[in-house]
Amino acid sequence: MSSKYPRSVRRCLPLWALTLEAALILLFYFFTHYDASLEDQKGLVASYQVGQDLTVMAAIGLGFLTSSFRRHSWSSVAFNLFMLALGVQWAILLDGFLSQFPSGKVVITLFSIRLATMSALSVLISVDAVLGKVNLAQLVVMVLVEVTALGNLRMVISNIFNTDYHMNMMHIYVFAAYFGLSVAWCLPKPLPEGTEDKDQTATIPSLSAMLGALFLWMFWPSFNSALLRSPIERKNAVFNTYYAVAVSVVTAISGSSLAHPQGKISKTYVHSAVLAGGVAVGTSCHLIPSPWLAMVLGLVAGLISVGGAKYLPGCCNRVLGIPHSSIMGYNFSLLGLLGEIIYIVLLVLDTVGAGNGMIGFQVLLSIGELSLAIVIALMSGLLTGLLLNLKIWKAPHEAKYFDDQVFWKFPHLAVGF
C-alpha cells in the first residue's frame, strides 16, 4: 500500500529535510574540525564506549520504548532514529557555537558527541507525548527548537549559577518532560470516533517496548555518569544509579500488581517505572554517600511512577490528549522534580554539616535554577506547539493519528495491520 502522505508533504518533507541537511553539512565544512592532538588510544576507546552506551539508549532504548502502539510501532522506532540523527548534528554545532566559537572553529571531540547525544535524548523523551499525532516535517521543527532551547538553557545555567556539565545536563529530565507536555497541549486533542483502537497497545509492540525499557535499564548508569569529571564521582554515580534502578524494577512490578484489583501486572506501568530510580537519582547520583539511600530513592521513585501511571493518564488524556501508554512525560516530570528535591536536600545537609549559615541562599539558587529550566521548557514547548499547528506542515488529520500506514509503504497489506 503506498504512502498516504498528502502530495504537498511529499514535496515538503524531502525538500525541508535535505535542505536542512545540506545546511548542516556546510556549517560543518566551514566551522568545525577534529581534535588532532595525540592521545592515549586506550583512553580513546574507553571514552567512545560511554558514547556508544548513550547511542544505544537513544536509538534502541527510547526508540523501542515508544513503540507500544498497535498501529504506530514502525513510525515510533524510525522517527526516533531520524530525530536522534538530526538532533546530534545540530547539538554538536550549537554546543560548539555557544562554548567555543570565540576561537573561530568548533573542535569536535568524542566528548562533544557525548554531549550532543544527551541533548538529542531530550527530544526523544519529549516526543513520547506527541508521537502519532505529528509527521516527520513537524518533528524536524521540534528537534531544532528543543535542542536549541536546551543548549541555551545549559549555557545560561552554567553562566548564571556556575554549574558544571553534569548539573546543567541533569535538568534534561524536567526540561524534556515539560517541553513535551506543553507541545502536546497545543496539538489537536480529540480522537475521532473509530480511531480509539489505534492508540491501544498490542502484544508484539509491547514486547518491543519492554525491550526498549531493558536497554534503558542496562545503560542508565552510563547516562547518569557520562559527564562527571573524575573516576570516583563516576564510580559513585554508576553504583547509585544501578542500586536505584534495581530497586525501582522490584517496586514497579510489585507495585503494579498491588495497584490492580486482581493483582495483575500492567505492561504500561512496568515499561516506565523500571526507569524511575535512574531518573530520580540523576542529579545527585554522584553525591549520594551510601547504597541504602539510593535504594530508598529507587523505592520511592518506583512507587511514584506506578501511582502516577495509575492516576494521571486520565487527566493527561483529557487535558493534553496524551494516550494512556505515553506516560514518559508526566513520569519524568514527577521523577525529575523528585531528583531535584533530593539534590536540594543534599545541598542543605552539606551546608549544615560544614557549619555555615548560607542554607537559604543555596536553596534559593537551586530553586531558581530548577524554575528557570521549567519556564524555558514550557515557553519553548508552547512556541514549538504553535509552530507545529501551522498549516504549512500538513499535519496528519486526527483520523490518521497513530497510524503507520500514513507514513510507511506496506506492499503486503491491503487494509489495516
Epitope: D40, G43, S230, I232, L287, L349, Q362, L365
Partner: antibody, heavy 125, light 106 residues
C-alpha cells in the same frame, strides 16, 4: 612520592609554536584530571587548560582558545601543551598541576594538590 | 566566577593575626582553595573546600566562608609565612584565581 616535571620551555618568536611536556610519577596518572596554569613575570596565577582523567574532555581559558591544545598520554604518564600562534602576552612560567577530588560532607571539592616546578616560556622577537 | 582579593598587599609583624578576604562574582558554594607562593617557587595548597586544612599545613592557617565571601586567617604570623597568597575557585571552569595578596614584613 608524587612528582610533576615540566620541560619544553624556551625562547620563541611571536607566531611560532612550542610544545610543553609534564612527566608525572608517584601516582596513578590515568585517574587524575590535569591542568596547566601560568604566571607572567611579576603577575598573578592564570589558569590555562584542563584535560579530564580519560582525555575525553578538554577546556581552555578564553585567552588561549583555538591556539593551545592540551593532551595526555596515559601510557607514558605524560601531559602536553601544544602552543601555536604564540604572542608576547603568553610569556610566563607554565606549571602543570594535578586535580584531586575529595568529598566534603556531601559535595565533592577539587584542588590542585601537587604542582610542577614550572618551565619558562619567553615569546620575543 | 571572578575572584577579588583584598587587600592586594599588607604589612604585618611576626605574631600578628592576619586576615585576607576573597569575594566571588557568583555563588561558588564552598569550592574555594587558598595557595601560598614564595618567589621562584610553585604555589602550595593551604586550604581546600573553603575551610579544610591540607595535610602538612600548620594549624595556624584557617579558612571560612561559603557562597560568595571567603576568608583566610593566619592566627599568629611566622617568619616563613611572608609570601603571596592566592584564592582560587574550582566550582566550574574556567578555574579562576584571585589577583593575590602579598604579605610583607612590617
Amino acid at each position: 612520592e608524587v612528582q610533576l616535571l615540566e620541560s619544553g620551555g624556551g625562547v620563541v618568536q611571536p607566531g611560532r609554536s612550542l610544545r610543553l611536556s609534564c612527566a608525572a610519577s608517584g601516582f596513578t596518572f590515568s585517574t587524575y584530571g590535569m591542568h596547566w596554569v601560568r604566571q607572567a613575570p611579576g603577575k598573578g596565577l592564570e589558569w590555562v587548560a584542563v584535560i579530564w582523567f580519560d582525555g575525553s574532555n578538554k577546556e581552555y581559558a578564553d585567552s588561549v582558545k583555538g591556539r593551545f591544545t592540551i593532551s595526555r598520554d596515559n601510557s607514558k604518564n605524560t601531559l602536553y601543551l601544544q602552543m601555536n600562534s604564540l604572542r608576547a602576552e603568553d610569556t610566563a612560567v607554565y606549571y602543570c598541576a594535578r586535580e584531586e577530588v575529595v568529598r566534603g560532607v556531601i559535595l565533592w571539592s577539587r584542588k590542585f594538590d601537587y604542582w610542577g616546578q614550572g618551565t619558562l616560556v619567553t615569546v620575543s622577537s | 566566577a571572578e575572584l577579588t582579593q583584598s587587600p592586594s598587599s599588607l604589612s604585618a609583624s611576626v605574631g600578628d593575626r592576619v586576615t585576607i578576604t576573597c569575594r566571588a562574582s557568583q555563588n561558588i558554594r564552598r569550592s574555594l582553595n587558598w595557595y601560598q607562593q614564595k618567589p621562584g617557587k610553585a604555589p602550595k595548597l593551604l586550604i581546600y573546600a573553603a575551610s579544610s586544612l591540607q595535610s602538612g599545613v600548620p594549624s595556624r592557617f584557617s579558612g571560612s566562608g561559603s557562597g560568595t565571601d571567603f576568608t583566610l586567617t593566619i592566627s599568629s604570623l611566622q617568619p616563613e609565612d611572608f609570601a603571596t597568597y592566592y584564592c582560587q575557585q574550582s566550582s566550574n571552569t574556567p578555574w579562576t584565581f584571585g589577583q593575590g595578596t602579598k604579605v610583607e614584613i612590617k
